[in-house]
Each structure stands twice: as C-alpha cells, then as structure tokens.
C-alpha cells in the first residue's frame, strides 16, 4: 500500500527492467502528494542498490503484487508463530497450576 | 539505436537568448532524467541543469540559476535550454545527456548517453 | 557545495602499464553517488563507472573503480592504445547538482 511522502520527489529516471522477487529486499510505493504529484515505486535489491521502477509497467505492476503477497504470507506466518507461542505458554501455565493442586 | 541530437547553438550577442533542442530516439524518453553539460573550449566538463522524467525534479548550477531554464516535451521526445541574459562565460559546446535507468536521490547511475553537442558562442 | 580534486592534472604512461587516478572530494561523498567519465579530443564524455566501483554497459574490465568517503580511484590495469585519454569523476549532491572534477589527462609516454 501506497505511503504518503514528506519530502519532494526522488525518482530522476526509472526503469523498465524486470527485477526477479528473489533479488529484492524492500519495495515502497509513495503515493502522490502537493510535493510529488507523482506515484514513486522505490526498490532496495538484496545487495543494496536502489532503483526507481516505472509504476504504469506491466512487469512492476506484477512484481508489486507478488512483493504484497509475499509480504502478507510472512506475516501471516509470523502471526501464526505468535499464536502457537501463546498457545505453548497457556500449556505451560495450566500445567503449573495443576502441579500446584496435585502438592 | 539510442540517439541525442543536439540543435539550436550558434553565434549571440551578450545579453541576448538563445534555446537549444535536444531530440531522443531508440528509448522511451519519458522513462528518463535528462541533462545539459557543458565544456567551454579547452576547458574541463561543467553540469548545467537537470530534469527529471516527469518534470518534477529539476536543478540548475550556481552559474546559471535564474537565467537558464531546462524543459521537455515527452510528446516529442525532446528536451530544452533555454538561455537568457546570456554572457561570454557561456560560450561552450553544450551537451545534452541521459541520467541512467532508475536513478534516484538515493542512488546515481551515471550518464549513460550523451550527443555530440551543439556549440555556442557568445561575442559581440 | 562538493568540489571534487583530481590527480595527477596529467600521467604520463605507456600502453600496457597500469594507471591509477585519485579523485577527492572536499567532504564526504556516499559511494553511491559517484561515476567516472572518460572523453576523448572531439568527442562526447563516455560512462564508465557509477556507484564508485560498478562498470557501465560494455566497459571492459580493465577499468574498475574503488574508494569511499572522501578518497577515489579508477584504475586501469593495462592501459590500451583506446585508454589514452581525459578521466573526470563526477559526484552527485542533494538539491539536486552534480559536480565534476577538473579532469585527469592520461597521455603516451
């Protein structure tokens, strides 16, 4: 989902070329603005580069979408660990509490 | 294949303007920050201006803030310079040059395309 | 605003000898906003390097670029006939401007 920008613009030129999911670190889109009237897409590759992509791309508009699936999966994950973690420690405590009857 | 064509240089008095052209082909013009450089004669590289592919971003040089104006047309796929209150100072071969795929704030990718240069002399 | 220093002003070398040119920055530059442009007499600059150490298009890798901070380098390991030539470094600044170093003239011995 687009952010909104604080600054002015920072894409001078951008690119075309496809960019492969596995290469990429981040990917921030920012939304217009009254100091940017224009949608910037920003990507960080694993190995540091940043790179200005062409939001009307057909292959950025699909890599966006695969880099907003990829993003909500891992989230999903990590929100699935969490439970299971809770779940684990609720184990645990019912497991003390009934120690504590048994003595 | 990928092309700058420089026109509009020639020979004006002090104080007087001038706009130079440049015209792109073989790339999606508007896909690119473009630039103007130039090199008075026997003299090292000076960067003039620069605009970006939208025409959002755009930045001038000390030495011709308030008289140069840089400009383009995507829909002709040509860039512009246009140069008031000009001075002997300004006499150069003028350069116009494409910023490389992607360039930011954040990261420069150098100019990858340069034309040959449009030279103006300013004498009286 | 940055002002970029190159050296030697001119290197006097022969054709298979390594060249190295240093460019300084008057203060700190972030490495990924510097290049390196090679002209020739009577014709237009030629991209190098960008990002201080990555090679453009179809640039032979005889020519690399290092450095950080405020010091730079493009070295050319083995100079060829085609090498002998004016090498600026050229730095970009927020603003945004773009500053170019006065130019190290590579000459036959």
């Known amino acids: 989902t687009p952010v909104v920008r604080k600054g002015r613009c920072s894409c001078i030129s951008t690119n075309q070329g496809t960019i492969h999911l596995q290469s990429l670190k981040d990917l921030k889109q920012f939304a217009p603005s009254p100091s940017c009237e224009k949608i910037e897409i920003i990507a960080t590759l694993k190995n540091g580069v940043q790179t200005c992509l062409n939001p009307d791309s057909a292959d950025v508009k699909e890599l966006i979408k695969k880099w907003e699936k990829q993003v909500s999966q891992k989230k999903k994950q990590k929100n699935g660990k969490k439970h299971q973690k809770k779940k684990v420690l609720k184990v645990r405590k019912s497991q003390r509490s009934r120690q504590k009857k048994t003595t | 294949q990928v092309q700058l064509v420089e026109s509009g240089g020639g020979v004006v008095q002090p104080g007087r303007s001038l706009r130079l052209s440049c015209t792109a082909s073989g790339f999606t013009f508007s896909d690119y920050g473009m630039h103007w450089v130039r090199q008075a004669p026997g003299k090292g590289l000076e960067w003039v201006a620069v605009i970006g592919y939208g025409g959002l971003i755009k930045g001038y040089a000390d030495s011709v803030k308030g008289r140069f104006t840089i400009s383009r047309d995507n829909s002709k796929n040509t860039l512009y310079l246009q140069m008031n209150s000009l001075r002997a100072e300004d006499t150069a071969v003028y350069y116009c040059?494409?910023?490389?795929?992607?360039?930011?704030?954040?990261?420069?990718?150098?100019?990858?395309?340069w034309g040959q240069g449009t030279t103006v002399t300013v004498s009286s | 605003e940055i002002v970029l220093t190159q050296s030697p002003g001119t290197l006097s070398l022969s054709p298979g000898e390594r060249a190295t040119l240093s460019c300084r920055a008057s203060q700190s530059v972030s490495s990924s906003y510097l290049a390196w442009y090679q002209q020739k007499p009577g014709q237009a600059p030629r991209l190098l390097i960008y990002g201080a150490s990555s090679r453009a298009t179809g640039i032979p890798d005889r020519f690399s670029g290092s450095g950080s901070g405020t010091d730079f380098t493009l070295t050319i390991s083995r100079l060829e006939p085609e090498d002998f030539a004016v090498y600026y470094c050229q730095q970009y600044g927020s603003s945004p401007i773009f500053t170019f170093g006065p130019g190290t003239k590579v000459d036959i011995k």
């Open positions: 040059a494409r910023e490389g795929a992607g360039s930011s704030v954040y990261y420069y990718y150098g100019m990858d395309v």
